[in-house]
Interface confidence: medium
């Protein structure tokens, strides 16, 4: 699910630049509580990445797998 | 601290290809892409294109597709970069350089600076007949 | 021709302000992505001097800052010292064509 819990760690730091979205599978929000907003995109690898969701390629990213 | 330690001088004729490598003191981690830039002689500086390991994939800059290859050796810890069909306009410095790209959620004492931030010495590649 | 346009040269006296420009497009400092500024001293591999617009990397005096604003970025050099005689090169992701750019760089001159 895109949407968070309160159980998800919370993102200090983002990813400065996009990685390709063919290799990003599932994405969601971190929790209200923290401190900075953020997006997890989790790679076909399984690895969470942080993304800061003002961010235009950012927010195309989850259009995109949210039409997928 | 990290280093990135690369092949020597290389020269080659127009046609040829080259091969310059990298070795990654700290070995090949996820939480970083390794890119190849280069820089002719007085020029400025051009990306042509980066392994990210995280990801598993391998991305290049538009004007070196189809003649340029980066591969990476976990078990060497080394970085390669072939270019093919050389001209003499191919002649230049070659660098790698890191660039962290794994951010996760949770503590980032561990992070470093956005950006390329750690760079070889370079390879001069000369392409001449 | 550089996807980033930097001033060729710049000059100043030891203790002077100087500033360089580095003007992009929608595609790149427009669009959000961070500006990092990289130092280059005579023949030598270039090093990151800031990243993420405005943050220096341990090791960097505070003399060095960075801003952007729009489609623009611009890095200063305050109480000019002669080590900082180099080129100065702008660089950032560009959604365009999907990779780093930079710009042509800039050769500082400490008169």
């Known amino acids: 699910s895109p949407y968070s819990s309160d159980t998800t760690p919370c993102c200090f730091a983002y990813i400065a630049r996009p990685l390709p979205r063919a290799h990003i599978k599932e994405y969601f929000y971190t929790s209200g509580k923290c401190s900075n907003p953020a997006v997890v995109f989790v790679t076909r690898k399984n690895r969470q990445v942080c993304a800061n969701p003002e961010k235009k390629w950012v927010r195309e990213y989850i259009n995109s797998l949210e039409m997928s | 601290q990290v280093q990135l330690v690369q092949s020597g001088a290389e020269v080659k004729k127009p046609g040829s290809s080259v091969k310059v490598s990298c070795k990654i003191s700290g070995g090949i981690s996820d939480n970083y892409a390794l890119s190849w830039v280069r820089q002719a002689p007085g020029q400025g500086l051009e990306w042509m294109g980066a392994v990210i390991p995280l990801v598993e994939t391998t991305s290049y800059a538009q004007r070196f597709q189809g003649r340029l290859t980066i591969t990476a050796d976990d078990s060497l810890n080394t970085l390669y970069m072939e270019l093919g069909s050389l001209r003499s306009d191919d002649t230049a410095m070659y660098y790698c350089a890191r660039e962290q790209v794994a951010v996760g959620p949770g503590p980032t004492s561990n992070r470093g600076p956005d950006g390329l931030d750690v760079w070889g010495r370079g390879t001069m590649v000369t392409v001449s007949s | 021709q550089s996807v980033l346009t930097q001033p060729p040269s710049v000059s100043g006296a030891p203790g002077q302000r100087v500033t360089i420009s580095c003007t992009g497009s929608s595609s790149n400092i427009g669009d959000g992505y961070d500006v990092h500024w990289y130092q280059q001293l005579p023949g030598t591999a270039p090093k990151l001097l800031i990243y993420g617009n405005s943050n220096r990397p341990s090791g960097v005096p505070d003399r060095f800052s960075g801003s952007t604003s729009g489609t623009s970025a611009s890095l200063a050099i305050r109480g000019l010292q002669s080590e900082d005689e180099a080129d100065y090169y702008c660089?950032?992701?560009?959604?365009?064509?999907?990779?780093?750019?930079f710009g042509g760089g800039t050769k500082l001159t400490v008169l």
């Open positions: 660089g950032t992701w560009d959604d365009i064509l999907n990779g780093w750019v």
